[in-house]
Interface confidence: low
Amino acid sequence: SERCDDWGLDTMRQIQVFEDEPARIKCPLFEHFLKFNYSTAHSAGLTLIWYWTRQDRDLEEPINFRLPENRISKEKDVLWFRPTLLNDTGNYTCMLRNTTYCSKVAFPLEVVQKDSCFNSPMKLPVHKLYIEYGIQRITCPNVDGYFPSSVKPTITWYMGCYKIQNFNNVIPEGMNLSFLIALISNNGNYTCVVTYPENGRTFHLTRTLTVKVVGSPKNAVPPVIHSPNDHVVYEKEPGEELLIPCTVYFSFLMDSRNEVWWTIDGKKPDDITIDVTINESISHSRTEDETRTQILSIKKVTSEDLKRSYVCHARSAKGEVAKAAKVKQKVPAPRYTVELACGFGAT
């Protein structure tokens, strides 16, 4: 067969859909690989062809678009299942071609089962709500394009297994779920079930997402360095191990990159000849505030090392801070027993 630009199996787009529900899957070629859209391709005389490989098989097969009630159909660049079945799981390929051009990509589709409480192997999107921030909303995701705007679906919201009605601070408003004041107790999985009619049939769309209540930007502060501080002096004798922890608290900030680093005499440890190691640990609070600890360690410190400047730095979207550790050389205690003994003429 003639050459075809094969983009391979696009595992970045691992598509999961629920069994016995409608699913609409766009050919990824136009979204991520080609610089033109389906309409342009169609106008240029290119044809979109679909085929698939069943789970645990190597054989590529055409998709059967002649099933009863048009269970599987194609519309423009979308492959429709009305509804899905478990054995629809497999790798699907969409190929765009004419006599002189060919491009194709495959993607995995997994049809998953859910139980009566909406538990399933589905990977859930996480929606973060700010704690005690005023009214915030989540929206039932990925339901666009399933029904025309003239169709008014019914939407039922659940928290875990429970239908949301008469909850104190959570109110269903159609496609939206409003949290009047988000609290830690609102953490959990929320499911919207969208029911709509089509050609005399009733379809259900189930969408579950995880709500995580996080620190509010109203309470966010620049990084706080707890250690090193002015109260602790790292007093060492040459040859001893020097351990200095840098412990920094970061308020939760959406999409903020939290950084901690040490400088020694103004240089990064990598740029200096000392044998220094740095170990980092990270912990999080319930609202995803972060505490990072970086321990600077010099196994056998020299008197030169004890004269250097050790500074802990921290940066977040809220600002940058730095704190120097107080490091000094321990003055050896006088060895009185020997000196006094010598003074009295002992041998």
């Epitope: 005023g134 009214i135 104190n168 601070n169 109110i171 408003e173 009047l180 004041i181």
Partner: antibody
Framework: QVQLQESGPGLVKPSETLSLTCTVS????????WNWIRQPPVKGLEWIGY???????NYNPSLKSRVTMSVDTSKNQFSLKLSSVTAADTAVYYC???????????WGQGTLVTVSS | QSVLTQPPSASGTPGQRVTISCSGS????????VNWYQLLPGTAPKLLIY???QRPSGVPDRFSGSKSGTSASLAISGLQSEDEADYYC???????????FGGGTKLTVL
């Protein structure tokens, strides 16, 4: 139909504490934020603060040191106390519900409180 | 001195269109939604516009709201004598961690 009604003394002496109560009828104090807003004579509206059913509060920073709000879920009421009042605290005091859209969608009729000896 | 700035007065003749502006900053209007309230003499304030431009049920479509950057405006078309009232804009202020109002605009129907 949710309705709000303010009640309390219309006259308070300087340096004393102003106390008002808002009764919620036709609905519950559970959920929503319950706010106090005031309007001094020939001046604009000023937000005093809010309370929720669990007792969580947020006060106007300029009044914070003098304001205390409380809620009584059994009576479906919430209250405002403003200490050390002066003539500048003379105003029509409104209670209002902060609804689903971050807006005061239901208001009480307002009660005029005069601070005078 | 109000955090949000409104013109103290506005006027128009019946049938005309009037616009009331509300100017703020990045910590209030710039990052939060704007609401508008109508205060008719002797009655409780009434929510006129929420979430920048949404009208609660019962508010005539003659009232419309808009927001751009750190400013918002309320437009009243087909002005009627019963529209004579005080109008206030309001928004949450992230810096003050509280609700702020404009100074109010007195609308006179000539």
């Amino acid at each position: 139909q949710v309705q709000l009604q303010e009640s309390g003394p219309g006259l308070v002496k300087p340096s004393e504490t102003l106390s008002l109560t808002c009764t919620v009828s036709g609905g519950s104090v559970f959920s929503y934020f319950w706010n106090w807003i005031r309007q001094p004579p020939v001046k604009g509206l000023e937000w005093i603060g809010y309370i929720d059913h669990s007792g969580g509060t947020n006060y106007n920073p300029s009044l914070k040191s003098r304001v205390t709000m409380s809620v009584d879920t059994s009576k479906n009421q919430f209250s405002l106390k403003l200490s050390s009042v002066t003539a500048a605290d003379t105003a029509v005091y409104y209670c209002a519900r902060e609804g689903l859209h971050d807006a005061f969608d239901i208001w009480g009729q307002g009660t005029l409180v005069t601070v005078s000896s | 001195q109000s955090v949000l700035t409104q013109p103290p007065s506005a006027s128009g003749t019946p049938g005309q269109r009037v616009t009331i502006s509300c100017s703020g900053s990045s910590s209030n209007i710039g990052s939060n939604t704007v609401n508008w309230y109508q205060l008719l003499p002797g009655t409780a304030p009434k929510l006129l516009i929420y979430s920048n431009y949404q009208r609660p049920s019962g508010v005539p479509d003659r009232f419309s709201g808009s927001k751009s950057g750190t400013s918002a405006s309320l437009a009243i078309s087909g002005l009627q004598s019963e529209d004579e009232a005080d109008y206030y804009c309001a928004a949450w202020d992230d810096s003050l961690n509280g609700r702020v109002f404009g100074g109010g605009t007195k609308l006179t129907v000539l």
